[in-house]
C-alpha cells in the first residue's frame, strides 16, 4: 500500500482544515496555554517499524477523531469545517486499517508498541481533562486546536516508519 504519500496528503489536508477552524483570535488566549506533554521524547528515541508506526498513528488519529466528535466539539466549531475535518480523519483511519491488513495479515496485530499507544492515550486524556477543567471554553478549544496541529507535525518519526519495510 502506498501509505506514505496518501497519508502525507491527507495529513496536510487535515492540518489545513484544522488551521481554518479557528473562531477567535489566538492572541486573546495566551494565558490559557497548557503543557500537555506530547510524548515526543519516546517517539524521537525510537526507530519505528512500519506496523508499529501504523498502529501508533492510528491511535493518534482515532483519539483526535473521538475528541472532535463530541457534542462539546460540535458547539465549538463551524459545522461544515468540522465535518470535512472529521471525514479527512475517518479516511486516514480507513487507509491505515487497510494497510495493517496488507502488512501483517488480518489475524495479526502488532503488540510490541503497547507502551507507545498507552502514551498517546494518556496524552489525549490530559487534553480531555484540560477541556473539562476549562469548561470547554472557546480559548481552551483554541489551545487544543494549536496542540493537535503541533502533535500532528511532531509525528515525523512515525511517518519515517511508514516508509520502512518490516
Amino acid at each position: 500500500c502506498d501509505l506514505p504519500q496518501t497519508h502525507s496528503l491527507r495529513n496536510r489536508r487535515a492540518l489545513i482544515l484544522l488551521a481554518q477552524m479557528g473562531r477567535i483570535s489566538p492572541f486573546s488566549c495566551l494565558k490559557d496555554r497548557h503543557e500537555f506533554r506530547f510524548p515526543e521524547e519516546e517517539f524521537d528515541g525510537h526507530q519505528f517499524q512500519k506496523t508499529q508506526a501504523i498502529s501508533v498513528l492510528h491511535e493518534m488519529i482515532q483519539q483526535t477523531f473521538n475528541l472532535f466528535s463530541t457534542e462539546d466539539s460540535s458547539a465549538a466549531w463551524e459545522q461544515s469545517l468540522l465535518e470535512k475535518f472529521s471525514t479527512e480523519l475517518y479516511q486516514q483511519l480507513n487507509d491505515l486499517e487497510a494497510c495493517v491488513i496488507q502488512e501483517v495479515g488480518v489475524e495479526e496485530t502488532p503488540l510490541m508498541n503497547e507502551d507507545f499507544i498507552l502514551a498517546v492515550r494518556k496524552y489525549f486524556q490530559r487534553i480531555t481533562l484540560y477541556l473539562m477543567e476549562k469548561k470547554y471554553s472557546p480559548c481552551a478549544w483554541e489551545v487544543v486546536r494549536a496542540e493537535i496541529m503541533r502533535s500532528f507535525s511532531f509525528s515525523t518519526n512515525l511517518k519515517k516508519g511508514l516508509r520502512r519495510k518490516d
Partner: antibody, heavy 121, light 107 residues
C-alpha cells in the same frame, strides 16, 4: 536549521518611508508568530508587536500603534516592519523573533540578527 | 499593560560567584515569564522559558524560579562568558513587556 534573516542596515532622512524584512527558513513559517522588538542605542528591549503569518492577524503595543505597520507574506515566509514617515527617534536596532503561538514551547527561541535603522538629516 | 521591574539594574560580580536577578510583574502572570541574555552587538538569546524551563543548549548553571508576580534568575557559578545584560519578559497577555534589564559586570 531554523533561521530568521533580516534585511540590511538602512540610513534614511526624516519623513522618508521604510520597510524592513525578516525571512524565516528551516521551519513551518505559518506555525509560528513573528514578533518585533526595538532597541534604541544604549537602551533596553521594547516589544513592538506581533503577527500570525497564517492569517496576518496583528497586535501592537500601544506605544507603537499607528507608528508602524507589521505585515507578512506567507508565500515567501517573510514578515515586514514598515514606517510611512520616519523620525529621528526611530533610530534603533530592530529585531524579529519567532513565537510558538498557543503551543507549550519556548517563546522567542530564534531571533534575527537585527536591522540597524539610522534616521538623520 | 503589565509592567515588569527588574532588580538590580546592574551588579558587579566575580567569576565563580552565585548571582541572583529578580523580576516583579505588576499583576499575576502565572508562569509565563522568559529570561534572555544579551551581549553587546548581538541579538538576545533565550535562557529560560515558562519561568523555570531551561532552553535547549543553555548551560545548567542557569536556573529560573517563581510564579505569579515574583521571579528569579540564578547563575550558580558565574563564568567569564556570562557577563552580559539580562532581561525578563512576560508572555501572559499582549502586549508582551520586558523588564528594563540587569547588567552583570566584572568586579
Amino acid at each position: 536549521e531554523v533561521q530568521l534573516v533580516q534585511s540590511g542596515a538602512e540610513v534614511k532622512k526624516p519623513g522618508e518611508s521604510l520597510k524592513i524584512s525578516c525571512k524565516g527558513s528551516g521551519y513551518s513559517f505559518t506555525s509560528y508568530w513573528i514578533g518585533w522588538v526595538r532597541q534604541m542605542p544604549g537602551k533596553g528591549l521594547e516589544w513592538m508587536g506581533i503577527i500570525d503569518p497564517s492569517d496576518s492577524d496583528t497586535r501592537y503595543s500601544p506605544s507603537f500603534q499607528g507608528q508602524v505597520t507589521i505585515s507578512a507574506d506567507k508565500s515567501i515566509s517573510t514578515a515586514y516592519l514598515q514606517w510611512s514617515s520616519l523620525k529621528a527617534s526611530d533610530t534603533a536596532m530592530y529585531y524579529c523573533a519567532r513565537h510558538p503561538g498557543l503551543a507549550w514551547a519556548p517563546d522567542f527561541d530564534y531571533w534575527g540578527q537585527g536591522t540597524l535603522v539610522t534616521v538623520s538629516s | 499593560d503589565i509592567q515588569m521591574t527588574q532588580s538590580p539594574s546592574s551588579l558587579s560580580a566575580s567569576v565563580g560567584d552565585r548571582v541572583t536577578i529578580t523580576c516583579r510583574a505588576s499583576q499575576s502572570i502565572s508562569k509565563f515569564l522568559n529570561w534572555y541574555q544579551q551581549k553587546p552587538g548581538k541579538a538576545p538569546k533565550l535562557l529560560i522559558y515558562f519561568a523555570s524551563s531551561l532552553q535547549s543548549g543553555v548551560p545548567s548553571r542557569f536556573s529560573g524560579s517563581g510564579s505569579g508576580t515574583d521571579f528569579t534568575l540564578t547563575i550558580s557559578s558565574l563564568q567569564p562568558e556570562d557577563f552580559a545584560t539580562y532581561y525578563c519578559q512576560q508572555s501572559n497577555t499582549l502586549p508582551f513587556t520586558f523588564g528594563q534589564g540587569t547588567k552583570v559586570e566584572i568586579k
